[in-house]
Interface confidence: low
C-alpha cells in the first residue's frame, strides 16, 4: 500500500530457473519406406536450452525435416505456389513464405503438381500442420524451481525468494502453499485460465510475474515476493502475425562428406519472469 | 505530456520477434587443394539462433575454421608472434592474444615463417579479416515481426503494439505506416542514419526503441507504441576494445573416433528491443 | 545525491560482453577399458556460449555422459533406487530424481547391486559428485570486456562506459583503476568477498553492478559509471533447492545409423550485469 | 460435451470373467488418461485402474493387480476393461471416467482428477 513518507526504489532483481521432468513421445517414424510407432525420451537436455537471464523455454511440439542437403528441388506446394510452365516462375526471386531462391523453371513435385525449383535446402521444409495432440503434452507436469535475488541498492538491502525454512518437495499452490517457488507448469496454465494442452500445440509465451512490495521500514517490515500469471501472446492472433511461439534450429552433420542438416520447428512455451515492485523506507 | 495530477507506473514488458528472408551466399570454397565458388542458402535456422527475450541476432558475415582438432601446432603469425629459436617461446604459457598454451618449442609456421608451438585446437584460427562485402550482406532486406505485450500493474492494465485491426503484409515506415510492426533490417539502419551493408562487415548493435506514453483517463485515453532506432555499439572504438559485434562458436563431430571440431566465428546484428514509458491515470 | 529540484529519469540499457582466455584441462580419459591422463584445451567457443542480453556464462566444471543411447538399462542405484524384486518397480513410473520411465522389472545394475529398469538414454548418467578442484578452474585468469551504453531518452542524452582515451590493456581495479572496463574474473569474486577456486566447483550466480548517478545539469555535469560485485546465489542453500548453478546440454550423433548422445552437465558461474541509476536535471 | 457409456456388466460366479465396454462419444478422449471406478452399495466410490492417453502405461488397485486388465482403442473411442478370477468383493456399479488432471503419474488413483459421466454398468459376483 501507498505510504507517502516513505523513499521509494524500484527492485533490482536477478532469477535462476531449474525445469525438471521426463517426457515420453510417440510419433510415426518412417526408415527405409516402412512407418512404425516410435518411442522415446526426452528430459531437460532434450526439451530445453542453456538460456540466461528472465526466460526459459520448454518445448512440447515439433515438426523435423531429416536430411536435408544444400541443392536444387522443387518447392512445396502451398496455397499459390503451382506453376504450369516456367513463365510462373522468376530466377532469383525469393518468395517470403518460400524457402529457396527459384531458378526459374517449373518442374514436378508429385504425379500431380508442379513448382518452381528453388536452390534451398532439400527437400523443403513441409508445411504441414504442428501435430495434435502436442508430441509432449506431457510437459503439463513438469516442474520450474525459480530462484530470484533482489536488491534495493538505495536502501541496501537484498533479499530472496527462497527462504531457509522452505520445503524443496513443495509445490506452488495459491492458497495452500503461495511462497513455494517450485512451480508445476500444468498449475500456472491453470492459474492464468489457459488450458496447456491445447497452448502446446502452436506454443505460447506465458508471464509469471514475481510483486515485491516491500516496507523495509524495521517497526514495520515486510518483504516477500506475490505471484501471478496471465498469458502474454495473443491467442486471438491472425495467421498472418505469426500465432503461438516456435523457432526453426538446426543439426548439422556430414554423411559422404556431404554437409547434411535436421530441421526442427520446435513449438512451445516461452516462460517470461516479470520482477517488478518497490521498497520504501521511512 | 506531464500530467501532474496522475499517478505514474512504469511498463512490464515482454517481447516476441520472428525475423523472416533468406540469403544467398557466395564465397570460395577449397577441397582437395581446389578452390572454387560456392553457393549456398542461408534460412533462418542458419543465420539466427534461439534466442530469448529482448535481443535477436542476424549473423551477416562469418569466417570458418573448418577440421580442428586438440593437438600441437605452430600458433598464428600475427605481428610480434614470430620466433626464430626456442627461447622466445615459453612452456605453459598462454598469450591472450593466443589460441592455445605454449610448449615451449620454435616451429615453422610455413616455408617462411616459424611460430611457437602451441596445444590447442589445430589448424589455429587465421586471424584474417572478416570478408568485405560481408557474406549475408542481403540481410538488409529480411525483415523482423515484434511483437510487443504491454502491463501496467498497478493500473490492472494490459495491451500489445499489434491490434486486430492491423495488417500482416505491412512495413514499417515512420510517415506512412508507423504503427505497422514489421520492420525491414535496412530500414532500421536508415533511420539510425546507418550504413547496412558497411555494418554487416564487422556487425554491430542496433537498438529499437519502443516508447509507449499511456494516459489510461478514461476521458482522454491513449496507449500506442512509438518506434525509435539508434546504433548501440560505438563505430569510432578503438581496435582494443573490440570494434562491432561477433562471437565464436563450435560444430562439433566425430571422424574416424576422433573429436573435431568447426569455429564459427560469426559477425552481425545484435538487435536489442528496449522497452520503456509510463502509464498515467487519475 | 538527490537534488530535489531536478526530474530524475530512469536509465535505459544495453550490454555487450566480450570473455578472454583459454583453459588446460587435465582429466581422467577411458577408452577401451585404459584409464589415462587426457589433457585438452578450452577457448571460448568451448567453454561460453553465444547469450545475448545481460548475462554471459563460463563453464567452470563438467560431468560427462557419453555414448547414451535410447534403450531400456537399470536405473542409478542412487539412495532409495535399489530393489529386490519386481514388485519394488512400477512400470509407467517416472520418478523425479531418475532419468526415465520405468519398465515394471528389476535388474542387476552390478554385480551386487539391482535397481529398477528404465526406458531412458543409457547408460544413464551416473550421479557423481562434480570434480574437485573444478576442471577449468583457471578460469579465474580470464577476462571480461564490457561495453554498456545507456540512454536517457526524456533528457535525449546518451553517453558509455568506454571513453575514447580509455586503454585497452588495462584491468579493472576498485583503486587504480575504477573506470576500465575490463575485469579479471578472480578479481570480481574477490571483490565480493568469494573464493573462485570454490564456487568454480559447483558454479553460480554473479552480479555486476553498473549504477550511473548522472547530472546532467550543464553547470555540474557527471555521468560516470561505478562498479559493483556481489553473489547472487545463495551458498548456504539447501541440498533440495538445487545449489550453486548447473544445465545439462547434450551433443547430438549418428554412429552406426543410430542416434546418439553426449550429455554434458555444465557447472560455471553465471555473471549478471545489472545495470541501474537515474539521470537527473533542472 | 463428452459421454461414457459403460457395458458388459452382469451376474457372474466367482471366479469368471467379465468385459466392460466404455463408449466416448460427443469428443475424443484420446488426448486424456482414463480410468475404472466403483461403488459398492454404502461404500465410496474407489479407483480401480487407469490408463494413460497412449494406452502405454497402466495403474492398478493392489486387490485387482493380476486380475484385471485395463485396455483402450483410441480409433474407437472405447475403453476396457477385462476382469478375470472374479470375486464377492469386485460386486459393485462399475463407472468409467476421463482424466482431467493434474499429473496422471501422481494422480491416476484420485477421483478428484477425473470427470465422471456414466450412468455406471453393474457387476455382481456371487459365491
Known amino acids: 500500500s501507498d505510504k507517502l513518507y516513505q523513499r521509494k526504489e524500484p527492485v533490482i532483481s536477478s532469477v535462476h530457473t531449474k525445469v525438471k521432468g521426463i517426457a515420453e513421445v510417440t510419433e510415426n517414424v518412417t526408415e527405409g519406406g516402412v512407418t512404425k510407432l516410435g518411442h522415446s525420451i526426452f528430459d531437460t537436455a532434450d526439451y530445453t536450452f542453456p538460456l540466461q537471464g528472465n526466460s526459459f523455454f520448454v518445448m512440447t511440439n515439433y515438426v523435423k525435416s531429416e536430411g536435408q542437403v544444400q541443392t536444387l528441388c522443387p518447392e512445396y506446394p502451398r496455397r499459390g505456389a503451382q506453376c504450369s510452365s516456367d513463365r510462373r516462375c522468376k530466377k532469383g526471386w525469393m518468395d517470403p513464405q518460400s524457402k529457396g531462391i527459384q531458378t526459374g523453371r517449373c518442374v514436378p513435385y508429385d504425379k500431380t503438381r508442379k513448382t518452381c525449383e528453388v536452390s534451398a535446402w532439400c527437400p523443403t521444409e513441409e508445411e504441414k500442420e504442428a501435430p495434435r495432440p502436442a508430441l509432449l503434452r506431457s510437459a503439463e507436469n513438469f516442474t520450474v524451481l525459480i530462484k530470484n535475488n533482489i536488491h534495493f541498492p538505495g536502501h541496501n538491502y537484498t533479499t530472496r525468494n527462497i527462504l531457509p525454512t522452505m520445503n524443496g518437495s513443495c509445490t506452488f499452490h495459491k492458497t495452500w502453499d503461495p511462497q513455494c517457488s517450485i512451480f508445476r507448469l500444468g498449475d500456472i496454465f491453470q492459474e492464468a485460465g489457459e488450458n496447456f494442452t491445447e497452448v502446446a500445440v502452436q506454443g505460447g509465451i506465458m508471464g509469471i510475474e514475481i510483486y515485491w512490495d516491500c516496507n523495509l521500514d524495521s517497526w514495520s517490515h515486510h518483504c516477500r515476493p506475490r505471484y501471478s500469471f496471465r498469458r502474454l501472446d495473443d491467442k486471438n492472433m491472425d495467421e498472418s502475425f505469426v500465432p503461438g511461439y516456435n523457432f526453426r534450429y538446426a543439426k548439422y552433420y556430414k554423411e559422404n562428406n556431404v554437409e547434411k542438416r535436421t530441421l526442427i520447428k520446435a513449438f512451445g512455451i516461452r516462460f517470461d519472469i516479470l520482477v517488478f515492485g518497490t521498497g520504501g523506507k521511512f | 505530456s506531464d500530467k501532474l495530477y496522475q499517478r505514474k507506473e512504469p511498463v512490464i514488458s515482454s517481447v516476441h520477434t520472428k525475423v523472416k528472408g533468406i540469403a544467398e551466399v557466395t564465397e570460395n570454397v577449397t577441397e582437395g587443394g581446389v578452390t572454387k565458388l560456392g553457393h549456398s542458402i542461408f534460412d533462418t535456422a542458419d543465420y539466427t539462433f534461439p534466442l530469448q527475450g529482448n535481443s535477436f541476432f542476424v549473423m551477416t558475415n562469418y569466417v570458418k575454421s573448418e577440421g580442428q582438432v586438440q593437438t600441437l601446432c605452430p600458433e598464428y603469425p600475427r605481428r610480434g608472434a614470430q620466433c626464430s629459436s626456442d627461447r622466445r617461446c615459453k612452456k605453459g604459457w598462454m598469450d591472450p592474444q593466443s589460441k592455445g598454451i605454449q610448449t615451449g618449442r620454435c616451429v615453422p609456421y610455413d616455408k617462411t615463417r616459424k611460430t611457437c608451438e602451441v596445444s590447442a585446437w589445430c589448424p589455429t584460427e587465421e586471424e584474417k579479416e572478416a570478408p568485405r562485402p560481408a557474406l549475408l550482406r542481403s540481410a538488409e532486406n529480411f525483415t523482423v515481426l515484434i511483437k510487443n505485450n504491454i502491463h501496467f500493474p498497478g493500473h490492472n492494465y494490459t495491451t500489445r503494439n499489434i491490434l486486430p485491426t492491423m495488417n500482416g503484409s505491412c512495413t514499417f515506415h515512420k510517415t506512412w505506416d508507423p504503427q505497422c510492426s514489421i520492420f525491414r533490417l535496412g530500414d532500421i539502419f536508415q533511420e539510425a542514419g546507418e550504413n547496412f551493408t558497411e555494418v554487416a562487415v564487422q556487425g554491430g548493435i542496433m537498438g529499437i526503441e519502443i516508447y509507449w506514453d499511456c494516459n489510461l483517463d478514461s476521458w482522454s485515453h491513449h496507449c500506442r507504441p512509438r518506434y525509435s532506432f539508434r546504433r548501440l555499439d560505438d563505430k569510432n572504438m578503438d581496435e582494443s576494445f573490440v570494434p562491432g559485434y561477433n562471437f565464436r562458436y563450435a560444430k562439433y563431430y566425430k571422424e574416424n573416433n576422433v573429436e573435431k571440431r568447426t569455429l564459427i566465428k560469426a559477425f552481425g546484428i545484435r538487435f536489442d528491443i528496449l522497452v520503456f514509458g509510463t502509464g498515467g491515470k487519475f | 545525491s538527490d537534488k530535489l529540484y531536478q526530474r530524475k529519469e530512469p536509465v535505459i540499457s544495453s550490454v555487450h560482453t566480450k570473455v578472454k582466455g583459454i583453459a588446460e584441462v587435465t582429466e581422467n580419459v577411458t577408452e577401451g577399458g585404459v584409464t589415462k591422463l587426457g589433457h585438452s584445451i578450452f577457448d571460448t567457443a568451448d567453454y561460453t556460449f553465444p547469450l545475448q542480453g545481460n548475462s554471459f556464462f563460463v563453464m567452470t566444471n563438467y560431468v560427462k555422459s557419453e555414448g547414451q543411447v535410447q534403450t531400456l538399462c537399470p536405473e542409478y542405484p542412487r539412495r532409495g533406487a535399489q530393489c529386490s524384486s519386481d514388485r519394488r518397480c512400477k512400470k509407467g513410473w517416472m520418478d523425479p530424481q531418475s532419468k526415465g520411465i520405468q519398465t515394471g522389472r528389476c535388474v542387476p545394475y552390478d554385480k551386487t547391486r539391482k535397481t529398477c529398469e528404465v526406458s531412458a538414454w543409457c547408460p544413464t548418467e551416473e550421479e557423481k559428485e562434480a570434480p574437485r578442484p573444478a576442471l577449468l578452474r583457471s578460469a579465474e585468469n580470464f577476462t571480461v570486456l564490457i561495453k554498456n551504453n545507456i540512454h536517457f531518452p526524456g533528457h535525449n542524452y546518451t553517453t558509455r562506459n568506454i571513453l575514447p582515451t580509455m586503454n585497452g590493456s588495462c584491468t579493472f581495479h576498485k583503486t587504480w583503476d575504477p573506470q576500465c572496463s575490463i575485469f579479471r574474473l578472480g578479481d570480481i569474486f574477490q571483490e565480493a568477498g568469494e573464493n573462485f577456486t570454490e564456487v568454480a566447483v559447483q558454479g553460480g550466480i554473479m552480479g555486476i553492478e553498473i549504477y550511473w548517478d548522472c547530472n546532467l545539469d550543464s553547470w555540474s555535469h557527471h555521468c560516470r559509471p561505478r562498479y559493483s560485485f556481489r553473489r547472487l546465489d545463495d551458498k548456504n542453500m539447501d541440498e533440495s533447492f538445487v545449489p550453486g548453478y548447473n544445465f545439462r546440454y547434450a551433443k547430438y550423433y549418428k554412429e552406426n545409423n543410430v542416434e546418439k548422445r553426449t550429455l554434458i552437465k555444465a557447472f560455471g558461474i553465471r555473471f549478471d550485469i545489472l545495470v541501474f541509476g537515474t539521470g537527473g536535471k533542472f | 460435451k463428452v459421454q461414457l457409456v459403460e457395458s458388459g456388466g452382469g451376474l457372474v460366479q466367482a471366479g469368471g470373467s467379465l468385459r466392460l465396454s466404455c463408449a466416448a462419444s460427443?469428443?475424443?478422449?484420446?488426448?486424456?488418461?482414463m480410468g475404472w471406478f466403483r461403488q459398492a452399495p454404502g461404500k465410496l466410490r474407489e479407483f480401480v485402474a487407469s490408463i494413460n492417453w497412449s494406452g502405454i502405461y497402466t495403474r492398478y488397485i493392489d486387490s485387482v493387480e493380476g486380475r484385471f486388465t485395463i485396455s483402450r482403442d483410441n480409433t474407437k473411442n472405447t475403453l476396457y476393461l477385462q476382469m478375470n478370477n472374479l470375486r464377492a468383493e469386485d460386486t459393485a456399479v462399475y463407472y468409467c471416467?476421463?482424466?482431467?488432471?493434474?499429473?496422471?503419474?501422481?494422480?491416476?488413483?484420485?477421483?478428484?482428477?477425473?470427470?465422471?459421466y456414466g450412468q455406471g454398468t453393474q457387476v455382481t459376483v456371487s459365491s
Open positions: 471416467a476421463y482424466f482431467l488432471g493434474p499429473n496422471w503419474y501422481s494422480n491416476y488413483g484420485r477421483p478428484s482428477s477425473y470427470d465422471f
Open positions: 460427443g469428443r475424443t478422449v484420446s488426448d486424456y488418461g
